[in-house]
Amino acid sequence: ATKLTEEKYELKEGQTLDVKCDYTLEKFASSQKAWQIIRDGEMPKTLACTERPSKNSHPVQVGRIILEDYHDHGLLRVRMVNLQVEDSGLYQCVIYQPPKEPHMLFDRIRLVVTKGFSGTPGSNENSTQNVYKIPPTTTKALCPLYTSPRTVTQAPPKSTADVSTPDSEINLTNVTDIIRVPVFN
């Protein structure tokens, strides 16, 4: 069975979060997708979204967030460049399907951004620093203003467990699995 998981990414200021959310392409290929932050006890806040209908592999940039929807592969790529400590938080991808509720995609991302020279990688970071060159053709999409009361999400309690490898999966009652992922540039 599909498990709702939360993956933890620990990065330094200035680095790039580069993740993907997969979806059933037959159902959602051209649907509008969004990247949201979930703050404790609050409704998810949409930070960026693709165009409507979503265009295939056409980058959309909103500030430091770049979304790229690969229709033919059923993947939404999300990049958050030049990370700041205040970007730390819990994120998720959703698919807008009005008038129905937004459809949440797996996995949620727990982002932890710490101070430090991004050019001096830590022990389990890659030594290559990716500097993304954003194509000049990126566009900014307008995101739907509606937020359904049923999309209020209770953020999972913060676990004190520190899982050192992705295979050390822990199951906590009523809490999503938290997997610590090696730091990516």
Epitope: E7, D22, R79, F184
Partner: antibody
Framework: QVQLVQSGAEVKKPGASVKVSCKAS????????INWVRQATGQGLEWMGW????????GQTQKFRGRVTMTRDTSISTAYMELSSLRSEDTAVYYC???????????????WGRGTLVTVSS | DIQMTQSPSSLSASVGDRVTITCQAS??????LNWYQQKPGKAPKLLIY???NLETGVPSRFSGSGSGTDFTFTISSLQPEDIATYYC?????????FGGGTKVEIK
């Protein structure tokens, strides 16, 4: 032991289908993507597509769309790749390969099966 | 699709020689480049990921460098067991694409 074990060689007639299996062991199957890569005799590597074993979602390159089906059975940590409407040019070794974490844009393959030779001949 | 052009397609060198293979992408791939080694009759093996990071257990005689569209793979001192075909692979954009391969032989 961390490994991917693939099913044995197959000989098929043009127009038929083939289903190759890839059994994972030694790691959490649902945490990493499974990719399929093929290699015709004496040729280079060609990526076919990916499978997220957790969600079951898949994606294929344009070339294989409509002909390839990627599935999984999480209870036995096994991924499958079925290719239909076979033609002689599909004769190749088919590899399954472990990709990055399911949520990461990390498309490198650090674990490979030994490959399954599929021969299409009338 | 991003085209990956590898050169040379084959080379012959002596044991102990420094061997260099180049890989050129048809557009900037933001350092999303990996290198694999494939020995005859075997599955490929990841050697280097993200341009220059050595996979665990891979000998330090293998290295990678480059940025933008031009990348280089080097074997500092060729060993008999390095006889293989080497492939580069980009993952900046889908579909993932591989170079055509470079076959390395011993003189």
């Amino acid at each position: 032991q961390v490994q991917l074990v693939q099913s044995g060689a197959e000989v098929k007639k043009p127009g038929a289908s083939v289903k190759v299996s890839c059994k994972a062991s030694g790691y959490t199957f649902t945490r990493y993507d499974i990719n399929w890569v093929r290699q015709a005799t004496g040729q280079g590597l060609e990526w076919m597509g990916w499978l997220n074993p957790n969600s079951g979602n898949t994606g294929q390159t344009q070339k294989f769309r409509g002909r390839v089906t990627m599935t999984r059975d999480t209870s036995i940590s096994t991924a499958y790749m079925e290719l239909s409407s076979l033609r002689s040019e599909d004769t190749a070794v088919y590899y399954c390969a472990r990709g990055g974490y399911t949520s990461a844009w990390r498309w490198y393959f650090d674990l490979w099966g030994r490959g399954t030779l599929v021969t299409v001949s009338s | 699709d991003i085209q990956m052009t590898q050169s040379p397609s084959s080379l012959s060198a002596s044991v102990g020689d420094r061997v260099t293979i180049t890989c050129q992408a048809s557009q900037d791939i933001n350092n999303h480049l990996n290198w694999y080694q494939q020995k005859p009759g075997k599955a490929p093996k990841l050697l280097i990921y993200d341009v220059s990071n050595l996979e665990t257990g891979v000998p330090s005689r293998f290295s990678g460098s480059g940025s933008g569209t031009d990348f280089t793979f080097t074997i500092s001192s060729l060993q008999p067991e390095d006889i293989a075909t080497y492939y580069c692979q980009q993952y900046d954009k889908l579909p993932l694409t591989f170079g055509g391969g470079t076959k390395v032989e011993i003189k």
